[in-house]
């Protein structure tokens, strides 16, 4: 798919505006930045993730 633009203007600690990151990144609300993002790797539990990196970004989880 098309790569998302990396947006680095979000610096407000209270901001709730989603930040778009590129395909291999996701938004980390702790550091208010786009960072490298990996797929979940938890074979020992029932938890799985079908999301690709960078999808459905909402900056409200850390």
């Amino acid at each position: 798919g098309a790569r998302r633009l990396r947006v680095r203007s979000q610096r407000s600690r209270d901001s709730s505006v989603p930040t778009q990151c590129n395909q291999t990144e996701c938004f980390d609300p702790l550091v208010r930045n786009c960072v490298s993002c990996e797929l979940f790797h938890t074979p020992d539990t029932g938890h799985t993730s079908s999301l690709e990196p960078g999808t459905a970004l909402q900056p409200q989880e850390g």
Partner: antibody, heavy 125, light 107 residues
Framework: EVQLVESGGGLVQPGGSLRLSCAAS????????IHWVRQAPGKGLEWVAW????????DYADSVKGRFTISADTSKNTAYLQMNSLRAEDTAVYYC??????????????????WGQGTLVTVSS | DIQMTQSPSSLSASVGDRVTITCRAS??????VAWYQQKPGKAPKLLIY???FLYSGVPSRFSGSGSGTDFTLTISSLQPEDFATYYC?????????FGQGTKVEIK
């Protein structure tokens, strides 16, 4: 293999300075955030500072703000903690750690997955 | 800052026991909680991230649950190597804050 190695700790007098280094291997620090966490003798963990080396954005605990400076040299894949105006209460083992993010519907599901071995800073006269 | 309050601060248990440690956040932190294990003289090790996801290589006897303000770390059957201090940490917002720790000792 991901590895973080701290150095630079030691004995320093109150009011003195030290610079800690955190040399990373097995990953590129510009892709993650790097954190310093300290642990005073017999006490719990206290976050000190973080940096996103890709753009130099930083933040600090109130207890060290204005005295400590976190920085990174991406060409050396190394993060630093410059500690000035040191106080007795800064005595601790200092760890650097990498924060990893996993993709989730809310963005980053993150935690500090790799830690260095720690370096002891003792502030005493 | 968000305060993380762990309980108990220490506990004594035997090998094979089921152990539960709780952590309460002073405000909603969604599922942005991790759990770490630390042994004396060693760096912390990540056990659980995002409240309930088992980190790679961690034995399945460890599990985490919770969201919002109340979180739990459970060890289903305590093993000799599990005697250590456990910390919760929130990373919902900066500054990331740790609980005060729970020391699990041999009964």
């Amino acid at each position: 293999e991901v590895q973080l190695v701290e150095s630079g700790g030691g004995l320093v007098q109150p009011g003195g300075s030290l610079r800690l280094s955190c040399a990373a291997s097995g990953f590129t620090i510009s892709s993650n955030s790097i954190h310093w966490v300290r642990q005073a003798p017999g006490k719990g963990l206290e976050w000190v500072a973080w940096i996103t080396p890709s753009d130099g954005n930083t933040d600090y605990a109130d207890s060290v703000k204005g005295r400590f400076t976190i920085s990174a040299d991406t060409s050396k894949n190394t993060a630093y903690l410059q500690m000035n105006s040191l106080r007795a209460e800064d005595t601790a083992v200092y760890y650097c750690a990498r924060r990893v993010c996993y993709s989730s519907v809310r963005g980053c599901a993150g935690a500090m997955d790799y830690w260095g071995q720690g370096t002891l800073v003792t502030v005493s006269s | 800052d968000i305060q993380m309050t762990q309980s108990p601060s220490s506990l004594s248990a035997s090998v094979g026991d089921r152990v539960t440690i709780t952590c309460r956040a002073s405000q909603d932190v969604s599922t942005a909680v991790a759990w770490y294990q630390q042994k004396p003289g060693k760096a912390p090790k990540l056990l659980i991230y995002s409240a309930s996801f088992l980190y790679s290589g961690v034995p399945s006897r460890f599990s985490g649950s919770g969201s919002g303000t109340d979180f739990t770390l459970t060890i289903s059957s305590l093993q000799p190597e599990d005697f250590a201090t456990y910390y919760c940490q929130q990373s919902y917002t900066t500054p990331p804050t740790f609980g005060q720790g729970t020391k699990v000792e041999i009964k």
